[in-house]
């Protein structure tokens, strides 16, 4: 179920266990706001369970770094694939234009 922010902080407890990067589906960081004047970190696990993480924990800070690195790598891979597709399309277009010229 999605995080519900009803004009207050979302996290009333935090996870005391270790969360592995492999089990993460999503990691949301909420900046301080008028409705909640503290940082909140909510992890969504691959099994759909949502859990709040302690922003002050060294393990959590390390997890965030790894997660952000993973996300940026995935973005690069996506962009790379898009770039490759564009190249293929350009090649196909140039081939077509050559074919047109030769006919």
């Amino acid at each position: 179920t999605p995080v519900v922010r009803k004009g207050r902080c979302s996290c009333i407890s935090t996870n005391q266990g270790t969360i592995h990067l492999q089990s993460l589906k999503d990691l949301k960081q909420f900046a301080p706001s008028p409705s909640c004047e503290k940082i909140e970190i909510i992890a969504t696990l691959k099994n759909g369970v949502q859990t709040c993480l302690n922003p002050d924990s060294a393990d959590v800070k390390e997890l965030i770094k790894k997660w952000e690195k993973q996300v940026s790598q995935k973005k690069k891979q996506k962009n790379g694939k898009k770039h490759q597709k564009k190249k293929v399309l350009k090649v196909r277009k140039s081939q077509r234009s050559r074919q047109k010229k030769t006919t």
Partner: antibody, heavy 122, light 108 residues
Framework: QVQLVESGGGVVQPGRSLRLSCAAS????????MHWVRQAPGKGLEWVAL????????YYADSVKGRFTISRDNSKNTLYLQMNSLRAEDTAVYYC???????????????WGQGILVTVSS | EIVLTQSPATLSLSPGERATLSCRAS??????LAWYQQKPGQAPRLLIY???NRATGIPARFSGSGSGTDFTLTISSLEPEDFAVYYC??????????FGQGTKLEIK
């Protein structure tokens, strides 16, 4: 194993004050939200107050707002309920309970103390 | 404030029978509902959370169902130790967390 032990109950006159304590062990208290729930003699359960893991926000039932204060000392693994301006209708068994979920929606009150009786009578 | 109405107030059954307890909310609570069992002189015990998830150590004969405004706690085959008072609790719109008035399950 998880243990929650309430103390500080007793008989008190209307208008007076009382402080309940709840000593926690067997889990990471500093990561857990805690509640007070009460039960008047022969009646059902009534939620009283909630304090998140860090004590940042506190939430109260309308019936106790402005009179009761929930607090915690994470270094002592202890939860408190300061009860001021006590009324006859505050007479109940008071339970401390641990929040099993993270956001207050998911989960439930997964561990409870044995309860402590507070009697407000002149 | 969301009001929870439990029915019946008292349910008289024999061991081995199936028990069906109902909890109705005055407005939708999605699936944010918990069930508790309380025996005389004891603290309540969490049975079901998020409408249908059994809490740790709760026997499989206990099951929860429903969403929105109508919820059911079912005990498939009653054991002698199941006779107690059962409360539902909404966790959707808090504060306050509200409890139903309870259903007393007694031996017939």
């Amino acid at each position: 194993q998880v243990q929650l032990v309430e103390s500080g109950g007793g008989v008190v006159q209307p208008g007076r004050s009382l402080r309940l304590s709840c000593a926690a062990s067997g889990f990471t208290f500093s990561n857990s939200a805690m509640h007070w729930v009460r039960q008047a003699p022969g009646k059902g359960l009534e939620w009283v107050a909630l304090i998140p893991f860090d004590g940042y926000n506190k939430y109260y039932a309308d019936s106790v707002k402005g009179r009761f204060t929930i607090s915690r000392d994470n270094s002592k693994n202890t939860l408190y309920l300061q009860m001021n301006s006590l009324r006859a209708e505050d007479t109940a068994v008071y339970y401390c309970a641990r929040e099993g979920g993270y956001t207050g929606y998911d989960g439930g009150f997964d561990y409870w103390g044995q309860g402590i009786l507070v009697t407000v009578s002149s | 404030e969301i009001v929870l109405t439990q029915s019946p107030a008292t349910l008289s059954l024999s061991p081995g029978e199936r028990a069906t307890l109902s909890c109705r909310a005055s407005q939708s609570v999605s699936s944010y509902l918990a069930w508790y069992q309380q025996k005389p002189g004891q603290a309540p015990r969490l049975l079901i959370y998020d409408a249908s998830n059994r809490a740790t150590g709760i026997p499989a004969r206990f099951s929860g169902s429903g969403s929105g405004t109508d919820f059911t706690l079912t005990i498939s085959s009653l054991e002698p130790e199941d006779f107690a008072v059962y409360y539902c609790q909404q966790r959707s719109n808090w504060p306050p967390y509200t409890f139903g008035q309870g259903t007393k399950l007694e031996i017939k």
